[in-house]
């Protein structure tokens, strides 16, 4: 036998109050699929959330992050601060990366230099706490007698002290 | 139609601790579902909700310390991820029974099972 | 979040008095008129009096009237019986995604 909420559309609710018959859903409020016996709560994006897409009775709000912070999580679950590139976030705010780390973007954590000698490479551009090192061609690649330019001393930056 | 607690017993703080709520003569996909707590000598505190198709909604206050799930048609579970001594209290399930036909969950609480208890003590 | 307050507690009365407890919200419930009343008494679940701020639930006595709108509601015991002596809780229905429910801190009622 065919359960009656089954014709319920989306937007709607069957009832079991009021012999299955189909409901809108009320302000507020949404259901995705068709034969639903209850309708959700539509979420609200308050405080840091920002509306990227509001609420219909099909579909639920999405939200996304007020500037200066980022999205997190499945849906946005999270928004967690920026911090500037060559910083991560702790517990007590933006710190800058140690040195021999580095981050290019406003979120996530710093992350080490690349070792060019695993790969039997040299350091072509020195990295820094925004920017990755640059490895270039390995130091046999030169053969005797071949014009070559010096390649650069890995060192740290001036100036900036390990923590 | 009825609906009963389980799962309630001493734990040390932080261990987690699941607590199940079966309900007979309906199904969950039906209802809305409720999780409410009773702290000794303290009154009735609201910790949140699973629609019919089992999304979950939270107080602030519950948010992370609490997981919601349905398990089957007739198993609802409430996790208490790392229980506190400020956790201990009867909790206790309920329908909503939406009595006035709005289509989600509007307070009319009922059945309640009759709570189970959760000691939180090292 | 919204708050409900309710009315200081105890409330005493004798029995066959009368006793009104009130239900104050700082936000207004869903629709004016998302409000329940539970009755709860030691070792024993709440038990649902009035669901939609003044709807009699199945099986309690017309002894029990629940009136009120928007922020302000209130629970009327009359022919108040030994047997009433429990605590009385308001819950609120609120349009948010959390904090969806928020119940008041309860009264105490006394029949003497």
């Known amino acids: 036998l065919q359960d009656p909420c089954s014709n319920c559309p989306a937007g709607t609710f069957c009832d079991n109050n009021r012999n299955q018959i189909c409901s809108p859903c009320p302000p507020n409020s949404f259901s995705s699929a068709g034969g639903q016996r209850t309708c959700d709560i539509c979420r609200q994006c308050k405080g840091v959330f920002r509306t990227r897409k509001e609420c219909s009775s099909t579909s639920n709000a999405e939200c996304d992050c007020t500037p200066g912070f980022h999205c997190l999580g499945a849906g946005c679950s999270m928004c967690e601060q920026d911090c500037k590139q060559g910083q991560e976030l702790t517990k007590k705010g933006c710190k800058d990366c140690c040195f021999g780390t580095f981050n290019d973007q406003k979120r996530g954590i710093c992350r080490p230099w690349t070792n060019c000698s695993l790969d039997g490479k040299s350091v072509l551009v020195n990295g820094t706490k925004e920017r990755d090192v640059v490895c270039g061609p390995s130091p046999t690649d030169f053969s005797p007698g071949t014009p070559s330019t010096t390649m650069p001393v890995p060192g740290g930056e001036p100036g900036h002290t390990s923590h | 139609q009825s609906v009963e607690e389980s799962g309630g017993r001493l734990v040390t703080p932080g261990t987690p601790l699941t607590l199940t709520c079966t309900v007979s003569g309906f199904s969950l996909s039906d209802y809305y579902m409720t999780w409410v707590r009773q702290a000794p000598g303290k009154g009735l505190e609201y910790i949140g909700i699973m629609s019919g198709s089992g999304s979950t909604y939270y107080a602030s206050w519950a948010k992370g310390r609490f997981t919601i799930s349905k398990t089957s048609s007739t198993t609802l579970e409430l996790k208490i991820t790392s229980p506190t001594t400020e956790d201990t209290a009867i909790y206790f399930c309920a329908r909503d029974g939406d009595y006035a036909g709005w289509g989600y969950a509007t307070g009319a609480f009922d059945p309640w099972g009759p709570g189970t208890l959760v000691t939180v003590s090292s | 979040a919204a708050v409900l307050t309710q009315t200081p507690s105890p409330v005493s009365a004798a029995v066959g008095g009368t006793v009104t407890i009130s239900c104050q919200a700082s936000q207004s419930v869903v629709g004016n008129s998302l409000l329940s009343w539970f009755q709860k008494k030691p070792g024993q679940p709440p038990k649902l009096l009035i669901y939609s701020a003044s709807s009699l639930a199945s099986g309690v006595p017309s002894r029990f009237k629940g009136s009120g709108s928007g922020t302000q509601f209130t629970l009327t015991i009359s022919d108040l019986e030994s047997d009433d002596a429990a605590t009385y809780y308001c819950?609120?229905?609120?349009?948010?995604?959390?904090?969806?429910?928020?119940f008041g801190g309860g009264t105490e009622v006394v029949v003497k």
């Open positions: 819950t609120g229905r609120y349009n948010s995604d959390t904090d969806t429910f928020v």
